[in-house]
Amino acid sequence: EVEKTACPSGKKAREIDESLIFYKKWELEACVDAALLATQMDRVNAIPFTYEQLDVLKHKLDELYPQGYPESVIQHLGYLFLKMSPEDIRKWNVTSLETLKALLEVNKGHEMSPQVATLIDRFVKGRGQLDKDTLDTLTAFYPGYLCSLSPEELSSVPPSSIWAVRPQDLDTCDPRQLDVLYPKARLAFQNMNGSEYFVKIQSFLGGAPTEDLKALSQQNVSMDLATFMKLRTDAVLPLTVAEVQKLLGPHVEGLKAEERHRPVRDWILRQRQDDLDTLGLGLQGGIPNGYLVLDLSMQEALS
């Protein structure tokens, strides 16, 4: 807090310029008109003020706009944005994608800060849904953004926005998130032909049900092992040996290296050893010949 003192004669700022770096903090407080500052915020971003001087300027804006800054000021905050608290940002109404981009640019190269998280939350809530342009912007700055959302939040993503998603944007998504995203991706890419469809849908397959995996196995997709290992265990278990062989194509040989890891391990336990032997990979742990497999869950459902 800077003490309230009168501005010395001849020091009243007529514009925001480099001469202000020579003002002491109390002089900035006394001699810079807050309304002038608000209209010339873009200039602050070109002047090498110290952090302490920026604190004074922020204080002046806070006094001028106790209910929250207007978007015309927010768009030009630059570094001053990083001095805002989440509480400050919750008072804002940010509707322009240009404003969002300008503020994300300030934080570029850093982790998502609480300020940025609050800003994004305010922006998305204001828009009502995560439209394609917003998602494009957010994932460009923060590839992990999508996976930071809850399944409930992801449900507001329209299928058309899925086109903006890159494989690396899904790297940290868990199965619950992929369960929400997969049906949207399936809808978004439904008009593509077989091989093109598979390229686009591949990153989302961690949310695919058994019937979709069975359908893919009929299309010579040659799924790689990394993708297979990310599939839902409950979706993989009902697949037959023949279906997995078709699904993986030449990559089927990789099953041997993964036989102790889920979902391969659990899938092996559900297959007849005879069928596994047809792969010629030496996979062990299948159901021995002559054993009858009862699906108790099915039996319970019937009773």
Partner: nanobody, 115 residues
Framework: LQLVESGGGLVQPGGSLRLSCAAS????????IGWFRQAPGKEREGVSS????????NYADSVKGRFTVSRDNAKHTVYLQMNSLKPEDTAVYYC??????????MGQGTSVTVS
């Protein structure tokens, strides 16, 4: 973003020093730079500034005619040439940079003693 100042030291009244400000991990070329100083027990004060192109410079009244700010973008360095030094110039000198989107960088300072 970190700036590194150097060139400080002990000098007699009337003597000269040249301070340097360089960037660590990025390039200063598109950064406007301000030089500040802080004497013991006093508020930090602005000394001079230079635009990113070097075409515009400003000075505090107390150093006008004695200090000169310049930049060598080929060496990614900004200089503060201090002549006719006085005991009241004794302080820790800092450089502050501002780049695209108002991104800031500041150094740890270099100490100047005029005695």
């Amino acid at each position: 973003l970190q700036l590194v100042e150097s060139g400080g030291g002990l000098v007699q009244p009337g003597g000269s020093l040249r301070l340097s400000c360089a960037a660590s991990g990025f390039t200063l070329d598109n950064y406007a730079i301000g030089w500040f100083r802080q004497a013991p027990g006093k508020e930090r004060e602005g000394v001079s500034s230079i635009s990113s192109s070097g075409g515009s410079t400003n000075y505090a009244d107390s150093v006008k005619g004695r200090f000169t700010v310049s930049r060598d973008n080929a060496k990614h360095t900004v200089y503060l040439q201090m002549n006719s030094l006085k005991p009241e110039d004794t302080a820790v000198y800092y450089c502050v940079g501002v780049g695209d989107y108002g991104r800031r960088a500041m150094g740890q300072g270099t100490s100047v003693t005029v005695s």
